[in-house]
Every structure is written in structure tokens, then in C-alpha cells.
């Protein structure tokens, strides 16, 4: 059984982890980013099912599909440094899912956009923070 | 040497269908999007679409929408503009061009020589 | 659809000339920092042929003779010295938001 002190890491995990994918999401899902349009040209694989941690396989999976994007989302006054965020992403998800069993993702047929892919995982993590608070 | 080279001259009659081709060669097609630009004769330069070879993503711009169809072949690192049917007021030459936008950047780096299409009866 | 108004539209001009075309948009086409201008060569029945870039960045390969300035809604194409292979049609960019426009472009004859 999974003791408090345990319970509480994995939940400052999600809050992480959280926090990343909303300051992904807010730094791109700007009306005035002049390369939104573009950036929604890519497509992501969605989780069929996205309920527990060993579901984080599925985002795992698409990582690096989601730097390639955040690469065009650079500025001056903006710096998102996709491989260190994409790095982070990583270690957290790697911690959370574990490693002890190996989970097979099933995606659901229809790909997604970023920003709806963005909004999937932050659904989950804030779904999952909130069966443990 | 990265390039891309388009199909050659098309002569078509109004209503008639139509698909010119792109082909990109020397760098990693599917890593780059591809934009079509139109130029009307003796006029300047309009720009009428995006696709992500990678996806198939589309993105056109609103005159554009309905009028034309872009569509990739990635196995053949081709991209396609087509036409249902065909009007005199298409008569253009139209290129391909191979968007820049990692970093700061947005802009279309490499063209093709382009394509003539004329649409007379 | 933000437009582009390029001055002078034509003009004619000597080798050795220092050359200035303007373009100025209908509302800032700056972000978070970064001005989304750019500007092409287009020479007849050629392709057009990337210049500058982000307003001031040079392409590679491009003779440093030419320069681009400016941010929010007016840039600048400076070519320092004007040579015979530089007579052509220039045409200013922007891809700040879509519908991405040209100017009406700017044909450099010989005088």
C-alpha cells in the first residue's frame, strides 16, 4: 500500500508536471503566436484511455513529437528551451509510471492538435492530483 | 543539394480537373512544411496554403478555401495543389515552397521554379 | 489580412547606386520581441529568391551588399551598391498572421 510520504511525492509530481504542460499550453495557445496555425498542422496520438499513471506510457510515447513543435515556438522574449522542458517531462513521467511492469498504449483512432493534446494530459494529471488530495 | 521541382506547364479547358505536384529531394521531407503561392500574370504573389507532409495537416488561406485542394505523398516526398474544375480566372503560375520556422523564424527558404497553368476554352 | 504597401512601386537606377525600398503593413508585425518581415528577389521567369529574413537577418549566400531594418509596421531593403545582377522585382513578406501577404513588389530597372 502506498505510504503518505509516497502518496505526497508522486502528488508534487503532477503538480510538476502539471505546471509544465499548462506553461507549454499558454505559451503557444496565443491568438497573436504567428505560428499557431502551423504549429496545429501537427498531429498527436491521444491515449484511448487515460485513468492511471502506467496511462503516462502513452505520453511518453509522444514526447518527442512535441519538442519537434516547441522548437518552432522560440522568441526573443520567450524562451521555452524545448530539450530541457522535454528532458524534465521525460524524468517526471519515467518516475511516475514506474518501470516495473511494461504497458502496451492503445491510441484512439482520431489524431489530435497540440493544444488538444495539451489539454488531455492536463486534465489527467489535475484528475489524478485530485483522487490523492 | 536540397530543391524542390515541380510538375511541368499545364493547358486546360474551364470545368476541367487538374493536380500539379511538388517533389522535394536533399533534406528530410516530412520535416518541413510545404506552402503554395500563386502569381497571376504580370501580378504579384499570393499566398493560398500550408501542409505538413508528415501529418497532412492543411491550413488554407480564406479565398482559397473550396477553390483548391492540397494533399501529400510522403512515401514519394510529394506535395499536390488540385483543382475540381478548373476556371479561366486560374490561369497563374503557382509554386511550392519549403517553410523556415524553428527559432524566430518564419519564412519560405527553398522554391520551386514553379508551374504554369492555363485555363482557356 | 494585414496588407503591404511597397514605395517606390518601380524606378530606375544606375550600377553603383545605393538603393532604399520601403514596405509598410497595416499593423505591427512584431512578437514578443521579433519583427516577421521578410524580403525576396524575383527576376522574370525565375522563382522568387529569399533575401532577408526576421527583418535584418542576411540568407546565406546572399551578398552582403544587401540589408534589411525596421520593426512594427515599417522595414526597410537597402542594397549599398547596386549591380547589374541586382536588376529585378523585390517584394516584401509578412508571417506574422495568416493569411501570410507580399507587398505589390518593386521593380529595379536600369536607367
Known amino acids: 500500500a502506498p505510504t503518505s510520504s509516497s502518496t505526497k511525492k508522486t502528488q508534487l509530481q503532477l503538480e510538476h508536471l502539471l505546471l509544465d504542460l499548462q506553461m507549454i499550453l499558454n505559451g503557444i495557445n496565443n491568438y497573436k503566436n504567428p505560428k499557431l496555425t502551423r504549429m496545429l498542422t501537427f498531429k498527436f496520438y491521444m491515449p484511448k484511455k487515460a485513468t492511471e499513471l502506467k496511462h503516462l506510457q502513452c505520453l511518453e510515447e509522444e514526447l518527442k513529437p512535441l519538442e519537434e513543435v516547441l522548437n518552432l515556438a522560440q522568441s526573443k522574449n520567450f524562451h521555452l528551451r524545448p530539450r530541457d522542458l522535454i528532458s524534465n517531462i521525460n524524468v517526471i513521467v519515467l518516475e511516475l509510471k514506474g518501470s516495473e511492469t511494461t504497458f502496451m498504449c492503445e491510441y484512439a483512432d482520431e489524431t489530435a492538435t497540440i493544444v488538444e493534446f495539451l489539454n488531455r494530459w492536463i486534465t489527467f494529471s489535475q484528475s489524478i492530483i485530485s483522487t490523492l488530495t | 543539394e536540397v530543391q524542390l521541382v515541380q510538375s511541368g506547364a499545364e493547358v486546360k479547358k474551364p470545368g476541367e480537373s487538374l493536380k500539379i505536384s511538388c517533389k522535394g529531394s536533399g533534406y528530410a521531407f516530412t520535416n518541413y512544411l510545404i506552402e503554395w503561392v500563386r502569381q497571376m500574370p504580370g501580378k504579384g504573389l499570393e499566398w493560398m496554403g500550408v501542409?505538413?507532409?508528415?501529418?497532412?495537416?492543411?491550413n488554407y488561406n480564406e479565398k482559397f478555401k473550396g477553390q483548391v485542394t492540397i494533399s501529400a505523398d510522403k512515401s514519394i516526398s510529394t506535395a499536390y495543389l488540385q483543382w475540381s474544375s478548373l476556371k479561366a480566372s486560374d490561369t497563374a503560375m503557382y509554386y511550392c515552397a519549403r517553410w523556415r520556422g524553428e527559432g524566430y523564424y518564419a519564412y519560405f527558404d527553398v522554391w520551386g521554379q514553379g508551374t504554369t497553368v492555363t485555363v482557356s476554352s | 489580412a494585414i496588407r503591404l504597401t511597397q514605395s517606390p512601386s518601380s524606378f530606375s537606377a544606375s550600377t553603383g547606386d545605393r538603393v532604399t525600398i520601403t514596405c509598410k503593413a497595416s499593423?505591427?508585425?512584431?512578437?514578443?520581441?521579433?519583427?516577421?518581415m521578410n524580403w525576396y528577389q524575383q527576376k522574370p521567369g525565375k522563382a522568387p529568391k529569399l533575401l532577408i529574413y526576421t527583418a535584418s537577418n542576411l540568407e546565406s549566400g546572399v551578398p552582403s551588399r544587401f540589408s534589411g531594418s525596421g520593426s512594427g509596421t515599417d522595414f526597410t531593403l537597402t542594397i549599398s551598391s547596386l549591380q547589374s545582377e541586382d536588376f529585378a522585382t523585390y517584394y516584401c513578406q509578412q508571417s506574422n498572421e495568416d493569411p501570410y501577404t507580399f507587398g505589390g513588389g518593386t521593380k529595379v530597372e536600369i536607367k
Open positions: 499593423q505591427s508585425v512584431d512578437y514578443q520581441g521579433d519583427s516577421y
Open positions: 501542409i505538413n507532409p508528415g501529418s497532412g495537416g492543411t
